[in-house]
């Protein structure tokens, strides 16, 4: 059913003829009765409903409701009557010394273990028994030696299996042996890929949940965007910027008649698109719905640009960041292009893709030079560090999954798609394929999928971002697909602009206020920066024409 609060405003004494009156006097549409949603908020619309026959994969609540079997005994009451968490349902009873504990917790006489008859409801009393092959005498039982399981269940906390020599303790699903005898809970959530987004561990179970703005697809158990418009994928093919709706799959040209566009990014909240043209050596911006009109395309940066191959928009602090493989620099500017400064001009060989995390204050970039690597630093250019430097050759595209805190990249020489966490740990090679990753270039992540462009295949592919499986072609015959971004409000979560929280406008900075990386609770929220021709003064806020070169941001 829909939102219960929409079905009748507040308590009402009389309900309409096509409405159901709840015990608490709320009115809801009659069709919401017995739909397994607590629309009344007191469960009265779900009481006295005809008993349903639940699917084999479901648990039947005492009141007839059906819930997923795996939700039983997970510490949360999903049955309206709480029967999925009741003692009767959940207690794995401790069996007596002369009894055997079945996998489902019930007890049978230990003498019935391995008697070739199923005495436990789940048949676990016959699991792990040694069988004598049939002979001309018939299927005889083996001569009984000492069965240690008959006494105190062999000391096993759960399942005791008698062997020809000795015995063995085992555990029901969701548990593991801690000390050869005692079963303890398996923390399935230690596997970062156990769930699409959030993993909650319970005793003997685990449960997947979704972040706000997402809801679980009951079929695939993946988290899908619940809010807003359907996501679309925007990509450049050098001469155009195009858009594919990921759900409706309609295809449109956003910006025609371009010269040599490789890099682009978006600002979702303002509906703006940003792109770099390598031939014109300019960075542009436009509103998406007007971007096809050259008169609506604003030039943001048109000086001291050589080869802007990577571009990223900080949607929180309203900055753009770009790499320049010709100048061998990484720079930042306000989104209107009015104020800019170079953050890095040293130790860059072939900088290409760049991505930002404004929530934590970091940026990440790839460099496919001789010593190929992926690096990160604060959005203000401090705390530069290398994340990946081994088993990496031509890292073209990089992208961030802010929810799982992982960076994904494609390597067009190794034909690989890999991921790593934001600290540089838990590296995973998801796909290695000369077919699907012939010459990958751009990469993007959304929901449970990773998307990438491939220049040789002239296609856009997608795959499961957790395991690299379910590879499929989103679109083909695309002629030079380069950079890609996903356009959806959940890709750019709102956050506070630290520079605007200050009492002074622009954080008191004379020129640029840049967010600082949030490494600890003591980290500064921002630092000030100056244009390339000026230096930051001793007050760390104002800019001066002369000064000590060491204080210059661009020398980092």
């Amino acid at each position: 059913a829909a939102d219960p609060l929409l079905g009748g405003q507040g308590p009402a004494k009389e309900c309409e003829k096509d409405q159901f009156q709840c015990r608490n006097e709320r009115c809801i549409p009659s069709v919401w009765r017995c739909d397994e949603d607590d629309d009344c908020l007191d469960h009265s619309d779900e009481d006295d409903c005809p008993k349903k026959t639940c699917a084999d994969s479901d648990f039947t609540c005492d009141n007839g409701h059906c819930i997923h079997e795996r939700w039983k005994c997970d510490g949360e009451e999903e049955c309206p009557d709480g029967s999925d968490e009741s003692e009767a349902t959940c207690t794995l009873g401790t069996c007596h010394g002369n009894e055997f504990q079945c996998g489902d917790g019930t007890c049978v006489l230990a003498i019935k273990r391995c008697n070739q008859e199923q005495d436990c409801p789940d048949g676990s009393d016959e699991a792990g028994c040694l069988q004598v092959p049939p002979t001309f005498l018939g299927n005889r039982r083996r001569p009984r030696g000492l069965n240690e399981c008959l006494h105190n269940n062999g000391g096993c906390s759960h399942i005791c299996t008698d062997l020809k020599i000795g015995f063995e303790c085992t555990c029901p699903a969701g548990f593991q042996l801690l000390d050869q005898k005692t079963c303890g809970d398996i923390d399935e959530c230690k596997d970062p890929d156990a769930c699409s987004q959030i993993c909650v561990n319970y005793k003997g179970y685990f449960k997947c949940e979704c972040y706000p703005g997402y809801e679980m697809d009951l079929l695939t158990k993946n988290c899908k965007a619940a809010a807003g418009k359907s996501p679309s994928l925007i990509f450049t093919n050098r001469h155009e910027v195009r858009r594919i709706d990921l759900v409706k799959r309609n295809y449109s040209r956003l910006i025609p008649m371009l010269k040599n566009v490789v890099a682009l990014d978006m600002e979702v909240a303002t509906n703006r698109i940003y792109w770099c043209d390598l031939s014109y050596r300019k960075i542009y911006s436009a509103y998406m719905d007007k971007a096809s009109d050259p008169k609506e395309q604003e030039v943001l940066i048109d000086e001291q640009l050589h080869s802007p191959e990577g571009l990223a928009v900080d949607w929180v602090h309203k900055h753009i960041y770009w790499t320049d493989s010709g100048n061998k620099t990484i720079s930042v500017a306000t989104v209107d292009g009015g104020r800019r400064c170079t953050l890095f001009s040293r130790n860059l060989s072939e900088p290409r893709a760049i991505a930002v995390d404004p929530l934590q204050g970091f940026m990440y970039w790839s460099d496919w030079g001789n010593q190929a690597k992926i690096e990160k630093s604060g959005l203000n250019g401090v705390d530069r560090q290398t994340l990946v430097s081994d088993n990496i050759e031509w890292p073209n595209g990089i992208t961030l999954d802010l929810l799982s805190q992982r960076l994904y990249w494609v390597d067009s020489k190794l034909h690989q798609l890999s991921s790593i966490d934001f600290s540089g740990g838990n590296r995973k090679m998801l796909i290695s394929s000369t077919d699907f990753l012939s010459h990958p270039f751009g990469i993007a992540v959304f929901e449970d999928k990773v998307f990438w462009t491939d220049l040789e295949n002239e296609a856009i592919f997608s795959a499961n971002r957790l395991n690299g499986l379910e590879i499929s072609i989103l679109a083909e015959n695309l002629n030079n697909p380069h950079d890609i971004v996903i356009f959806h409000e959940l890709k750019q979560p709102r956050a506070a602009d630290a520079c605007k929280l200050s009492v002074q406008p622009n954080g008191g900075c004379e020129y640029l206020c840049l967010p600082a990386p949030q490494i600890s609770s003591h980290s500064p929220k921002y630092t000030c920066a100056c244009p390339d021709t000026m230096w930051l003064g001793p007050d760390m806020k104002r800019c001066y024409r002369d000064g000590n070169e060491d204080s210059k941001m661009g020398s980092t």
């Epitope: 359907s230 759900v247 409706k248 679109a475």
Partner: antibody, heavy 122, light 106 residues
Amino acid sequence: QVTLKESGPGILQPSQTLSLTCTFSGFSLNTYGMGVGWVRQPSGKGLEWLANIWWDDDKFYNPSLKNRLTVSKDTSNNQAFLRITNGDTADTATYFCARILGEDIGGALDAWGQGTSVTVSS
Amino acid sequence: DTVLTQSPALAVSPGERVSISCRASEGVNSYMHWYQQNPGQQSKLLIYRTSNLASGVPARFGGSGSGTDFTLTIDPVEADDTATYFCQQSWNDPPTFGGGTKLELK
């Protein structure tokens, strides 16, 4: 089981507004990725895509008829609607509604109604 | 609009293999679908996105092609395959249908 059924006026006069209803079951237009499309077929001729509406209320209209078409939905009653203003004899056709599946199905019409015949005649 | 061209009619004997072609006036990527239409019956989706068999459709039906040239194949043809077959693209706006190919059995 997915079923769709179209209903309409049958006969109407030129310049009148043609109102069509598609009543469906087996799916919901609240469900992510679902849409309902309208297609027509003049007798003995080919099919023409008129309009469609998606779960998120996004609408598409065929540009050749755009200013005459309005598509809408009533999700609680599992219905979709099409209005064509200023009816003309060229609008005489069988009108179909069909379910559209997005994502990997790619906008194909995977379930159709039987169609309802509309004649515009003075 | 993207024009889809189909040959109007084909005649084939039961048990044979038949190929029905659909040519697009511009690239439609892989977003080509095929339908079967019989008078008085609901149209039926056979193939979606060039080569994917729709649910409940016999494996005798197959699809292939890319870019602008696409083919629906029935092998072997059976008596109740007599129908009109339409192609449809959903890559370019507006979505368009081919004129249909009427399949008759000899």
